[in-house]
Structure formats: structure tokens, C-alpha cells
């Protein structure tokens, strides 16, 4: 158990709207941990690394996560 | 439409606390982050506090740090700002505006003033 | 503390072009998104320019927005002015967890 019990989430608002693809510099998903209490889907944009929070529970994002995840399989040897 | 309407301003002595609210409609709230920025008499804008959309991160200016309190009820459509050990300083018209994203204020109230007065 | 500096005041005859700029105290003012919002007397704030060039829907294209990096400088320009864009004008950005206005600039159209 930390010492601190501080929340350290990241996202102020999320965003029902998937990212362009290929605007995306990376995409983080970040599991819910005793330092912030839910779920973070983190878009690093690659104009200047600007990060968009998505909403995991939102039907487009979750189509979204697919085509990457789908796209990143092809590359992968 | 987004339609914010702040309230809860009026006159009150320093060292004193107030409550200001702001009604949200027109959008799913419990998606966005919120803000408060006020603005002193013939002044200009000043940030206040920021919320997320869940509560569970606040940020505060300086100014305002451990003495004033961000909150909201999702359930209610409101945010709120506690206002404790007022000063002079403090008055201003407060505004509430929304966060589409980490960083722009895209939708503002028309305010509510605050006067700080003995 | 991160600050952001606009002229107090400007002004133009109508139909005529003007800048206002909102330059950044240390940092690179380009390394975050400016915002830049109107004001008219009496009346709320609201977003003519958002991440740095991109303008709402509902606002003309008179209205732009641009980054210079080598003045570490922000800028909002309008052209064919009119007497209805005489307004308060407010430039905005972001810096570790603290969002910071510019002073305001005053705008008459003559």
C-alpha cells in the first residue's frame, strides 16, 4: 500500500470521438491501479504530443482499439 | 445547446464563505472537466480551479489553494465552488466553463458576481 | 510562473487588418495550444481560435490564428474589421496543470 493515497489519473475530460489513426503518435492503455481508481485510454497526438483522453466505455473507442490493435498484429512478423 | 448558468453569488463580509453553483445542460457532463475563472471589476480573466470529469483530479491557482473547493454531482448536472475566508481580492464575476479536452475552455456561463465587502 | 503578455490596447479603422499578440514569459509557447477568446462589454468570454489555428464553426474566417516560434509568440489576426469585433480579446494556454490567461487586449474599431 503507498505511503501517499493521492489519486494521480490523468484525464480531465473524455472523448466519446475516435482519434484519426494517423494522427496517433502512440495509444496507452492504463489499467486501473490503487493510484488511479479506473480504466485510462491515453492518445499521445503527434502534434505536439498532445494527449486526448478516450472513453473506454464508448462503442466508437472500442471499435478504435480494435483497428489498432488489428493493424499493429499485420506489422508484427 | 450547451447552456451553463452559474448562481449562488451576492455580497458577503471578508473571512466569510459562500457557495457558488453551476447548472450544466445541453451536453453528457459526466464527460467533461469544468473550470472556474473569474474576472474583478474592469480586470481581466483569471483561473480559478479545474475539475475531471469524474472528480477525481482538481487543480487550484495559487491564489485560491486551501481556500477554496472544486466539486461536482454528476447526478445533478452541477458544479460547484466552496469559497472559504474570503478576501477582497476575491471579488469578481465567476464563470464556469467547460473542458473538451486538457486544455481550451470552449463553453462559458454568463456569470455570477461576488462582492466582498465589510 | 509561466506568463503571457499582450498589448493593452489597439485599434484599426473598419475593413482594415490587425494583429494582437501574446507573447510567452519562458518556455516555448509552441510546445502547448493557444487558445484566444472574445469578450464583449458585458457579456461572457467565448472561443474565436482554439489549439493554436483552429476556429469554431460559428466563427468567421476573418478571424486567424498562428504560432511563431523564433518571438515566442502567439497571434491572433482579423481582417475586415468591424465595429461589432470591438471586444476585450484574451489569449490562453497551459502549463503543468496550470491554465494561464494573457492581461486582455482591447480592441476599438474607429
Known amino acids: 500500500v503507498p505511503l501517499s493515497r493521492t489519486v494521480r489519473c490523468t484525464c480531465i475530460s473524455i472523448s466519446n470521438q475516435p482519434v484519426n489513426p494517423r494522427s496517433l503518435e502512440k495509444l496507452e492503455i492504463i489499467p486501473a491501479s490503487q493510484f488511479c481508481p479506473r480504466v485510462e485510454i491515453i492518445a499521445t497526438m503527434k502534434k505536439k504530443g498532445e494527449k486526448r483522453c478516450l472513453n473506454p466505455e464508448s462503442k466508437a473507442i472500442k471499435n478504435l482499439l480494435k483497428a489498432v490493435s488489428k493493424e499493429r498484429s499485420k506489422r508484427s512478423p | 445547446q450547451v447552456q451553463l448558468v452559474e448562481s449562488g453569488g451576492g455580497v458577503v463580509q471578508p473571512g466569510r464563505s459562500l457557495r457558488l453553483s453551476c447548472a450544466a445542460s445541453?451536453?453528457?457532463?459526466?464527460?467533461?472537466?469544468m473550470h472556474w475563472v473569474r474576472q474583478a471589476p474592469g480586470k481581466g480573466l483569471e483561473w480559478v480551479a479545474v475539475i475531471s470529469y469524474d472528480g477525481s483530479i482538481k487543480y487550484y491557482a495559487d491564489s485560491v489553494k486551501g481556500r477554496f473547493t472544486i466539486s461536482r454531482d454528476n447526478s445533478k448536472n452541477t458544479l460547484y465552488l466552496q469559497m472559504n475566508s474570503l478576501r477582497a481580492e476575491d471579488a469578481a464575476v465567476y464563470y464556469c466553463a467547460r473542458a473538451p479536452d486538457g486544455h481550451q475552455l470552449d463553453y462559458w456561463g454568463r456569470g455570477t458576481l461576488v462582492t466582498v465587502s465589510s | 510562473n509561466f506568463m503571457l503578455t499582450q498589448p493593452h490596447s489597439v485599434s484599426e479603422s473598419p475593413g482594415k487588418t490587425v494583429t494582437i499578440s501574446c507573447t510567452g514569459s519562458?518556455?516555448?509557447?509552441?510546445?502547448?495550444?493557444v487558445q484566444w477568446y472574445q469578450q464583449r462589454p458585458g457579456s461572457a468570454p467565448t472561443t474565436v481560435i482554439y489549439e493554436d489555428d483552429q476556429r469554431p464553426s460559428d466563427v468567421p474566417d476573418r478571424f486567424s490564428g498562428s504560432i511563431d516560434s523564433s518571438s515566442n509568440s502567439a497571434s491572433l489576426t482579423i481582417s475586415g474589421l468591424r465595429t461589432e469585433d470591438e471586444a476585450d480579446y484574451y489569449c490562453q494556454s497551459y502549463v503543468s496543470s496550470k491554465w494561464v490567461f494573457g492581461g486582455g487586449t482591447k480592441l476599438t474599431v474607429l
Open positions: 445541453g451536453f453528457t457532463f459526466s464527460s467533461y472537466g
Open positions: 519562458s518556455g516555448s509557447i509552441a510546445s502547448n495550444y
